[in-house]
Amino acid sequence: LVPHLGDREKRDSVCPQGKYIHPQNNSICCTKCHKGTYLYNDCPGPGQDTDCRECESGSFTASENHLRHCLSCSKCRKEMGQVEISSCTVDRDTVCGCRKNQYRHYWSENLFQCFNCSLCLNGTVHLSCQEKQNTVCTCHAGFFLRENECVSCSNCKKSLECTKLCLPQIENVKGTEDSGTT
């Protein structure tokens, strides 16, 4: 089976790399525009220059192209705790990230939120906080891991998964209740 090519890919594949087929005349291959520019007018004929114009402020193209418009620069999402790492230029989109001691959690492919790295209170750092992953904690005895925080076994209810980790403490609590001591 031959993979289906979109019209644009089909047209481009007829021309050598770095060129594209003229939309009105498929016998002409025009030179693509450099990154940081966009297509204003197709080349008038073979061997003649494509009319490329520089992207305006607030827009960019990051690779050679024959786009009729530059792409709008991304904005860092304040509500998600994002900060600007580097601003948008004509040939590169805005780069957004998180502050120091924070990590990115991706809710979807192109949406991330910044959260503070866990400090592992009542535990030890098993794996340090990374750009896209929270600290991995190991809890001290008498504590169990809940939502990446070390919580006292006194907060462990019988139905929760902590029962195995907190078994001695639970038995002690049960024993105290059974003996009727105050």
Epitope: E79, M80, H105, Q113, F115, E147, N148
Partner: nanobody
């Protein structure tokens, strides 16, 4: 006690429209960015849209961009999701939630409203 109550779901034909509402109480609604998430039958949670505190900045998943509009009325403590040009793949339970603060989990979200798109 934080409460979020969604309404407005129902059965609609492909191409149709629905407007979901989420009534909020138990917290200062105007101080919280809000989120619509959905869960299609047998699938995981999908982030649909979110809106900042004042209703200025919005975000839409690619799958709903140009068809859905999120808005809020802080004077009524209500979040909305206007859904147009509905498709079969929009069939899901829709939940509103407060944007998480402390970690990547939804501490506060509603019971959901079912949207079914079918002819």
């Amino acid at each position: 006690e934080v409460q979020l109550l969604e309404s407005g779901g129902g059965l609609v034909q492909p191409g149709g429209s629905l407007r979901l509402s989420c009534a909020a109480s138990g917290f200062t609604f105007a101080h919280e960015p809000m989120v619509w998430i959905r869960q299609a039958p047998g699938k995981g949670l999908e982030w649909v849209s979110h809106i900042d505190r004042v209703g200025q900045d919005t975000y839409y998943a690619d799958s709903v961009k140009g068809r859905f509009t999120i808005s809020r009325d802080n004077s009524k403590n209500t979040l909305y999701l206007q859904m147009n040009s509905l498709r079969a793949e929009d069939t899901a339970v829709y939940y509103c939630a407060m944007l998480p603060k402390r970690g990547p989990r939804f501490d506060y979200w509603g019971q959901g409203t079912l949207v079914t798109v079918s002819s």
